[in-house]
Amino acid sequence: FERTRSLQDPCSNCPAGTFCDNNRNQICSPCPPNSFSSAGGQRTCDICRQCKGVFRTRKECSSTSNAECDCTPGFHCLGAGCSMCEQDCKQGQELTKKGCKDCCFGTFNDQKRGICRPWTNCSLDGKSVLVNGTKERDVVCGPSPADLSPGASSVTPPAPAREPGHSPQ
């Protein structure tokens, strides 16, 4: 089949990095600068992606593969192939329409990206709060109150954090 196809279509012999040039009797011409073809038999080369502004070049474009971008420090990639760069916030914050805002009481974000999430509700699992939550950290759930009955081994909770919070009950 391949042999038949190449007899019918001379372009199928053009390797990656070239294109089948109709203006030159369908001979294989190298991709022009700033373009590439990642597969053989192509009639055109694709324009290389340019990493501009907050996008920086992670991998240069070659005649056979597109450039790859990532984000400049202070930003992180979103979307397939890093199609967007989003500004980082601090831990304990989330990016809103009005910029980086502190997490509301009862929520936390332990990363520089993403949204603030509610503290774990320890009581739903029949447990008690061992360490209070903060804007940057979730609560730590400890043994259930029943497990801490007299005679049972108890856990001494550490000193409260600087910004103590309580798990929403």
């Epitope: 501009k52 502004g53 996008f55 890093c82």
Partner: nanobody
């Protein structure tokens, strides 16, 4: 071909003012959201301000009440009026299209100018 050309940068004393301009061509400016970013050697890139085609404006916290973004669709020009300038505002300022309409987010299809240097120093 899309072109964004910034101008108006320079050296200014703390407390002073500058007005940056960005002349746009090669696309329908009036229906495009636009933004300003800045880049400092120490802090890297920072999203500064954005304006929707309808005129709604957005600012990063550190420039609120000091900077004003505006646009003149008849002149295809974006502006950034910078008042009460501080040494920490020293940066290269870039004009960019803002297709995502999301604070602090640019997409690969957005276009960028070459930047204009703003230096705030006594």
């Amino acid at each position: 071909e899309v072109q964004l050309v910034e101008s108006g940068g320079g050296l200014v004393q703390p407390g002073g003012s500058l007005r940056l301009s960005c002349a746009a061509s090669g696309f329908t400016f009036s229906s495009s959201a636009m933004s300003w970013a800045r880049q400092t050697p120490g802090k890297g890139f920072e999203w500064v301000s954005g304006i929707y085609s309808g005129g709604s404006t957005y600012y990063t916290e550190s420039v609120k009440d000091r900077f004003t973004i505006s646009r003149d669709n008849s002149k295809n020009t974006l502006y950034l009026q910078m008042n009460s300038l501080r040494p920490e505002d020293t940066a290269v300022y870039y004009c960019a299209t803002w297709g995502t309409l999301r604070f602090g987010v640019w997409a690969e299809y957005d276009h960028w100018g070459q930047g204009t240097q703003v230096t705030v120093s006594s």
